[in-house]
Amino acid sequence: TPEVWVQVRMEATELSSFTIRCGFLGSGSISLVTVSWGGPNGAGGTTLAVLHPERGIRQWAPARQARWETQSSISLILEGSGASSPCANTTFCCKFASFPEGSWEACGSLPPSSDPGLSAPPTPAPILRAD
């Protein structure tokens, strides 16, 4: 069964800077990745970035840099200040779509006891939805 993992890290140098990494553990080819915060996209979450493997990347503030790391994983750097700044308990969600086979989404947030700049290696997060 395909799974999605999400890792959130706060940068030690800039406390308002977050790095979100997401990956797809499955055999299907990815047609689109959507990253949101505040909950799943379409369920109250706000889209931060959308990545297409061939057509490009779209991103919105406070997203600073979204990129593909591998064919099945992406990373997103967030920088914010004031109202647009993420906080330590912000939830980030990643949805990997393989059209028309299905889509898989998982969410994560900064580990409550983690020091800035430190985090555990990525582990599969619960699948919230598999269409």
Partner: nanobody, 121 residues
Framework: EVQLVESGGGLVQPGGSLRLSCAAS????????MGWFRQAPGKGLDEGVA????????KYADSVKGRFTISRDNAKNSLYLQMNSLRAEDTAVYYC??????????????WGQGTQVTVSS
Amino acid sequence: EVQLVESGGGLVQPGGSLRLSCAASGFTFSGDCMGWFRQAPGKGLDEGVATIDNAGRIKYADSVKGRFTISRDNAKNSLYLQMNSLRAEDTAVYYCAAGWTFGGQCSPADWGQGTQVTVSS
């Protein structure tokens, strides 16, 4: 939960017409386009057969221009595809999808289960 439900498919003779409907519910979509996509038996997925973006710009695949018409009813949260002068090569599973525009193409982020359209005499 996201739900896009297609209806209106079926068996029709060449030259006939069908109207596909897609009802969206259970979510507020944050993308910027919706459209109809199709997958013919034993073939790959077609690029958007007909798509419409948030500004109302409509795009059709060359193979359906002049025969298919896409429309939407925002009040009913619905998308439609009127298909006229159907041909055997239009036989496929048709998917309603909502997505994001990249380079003028609508890329699906959410979609329904699909509805079968068969054109045969």
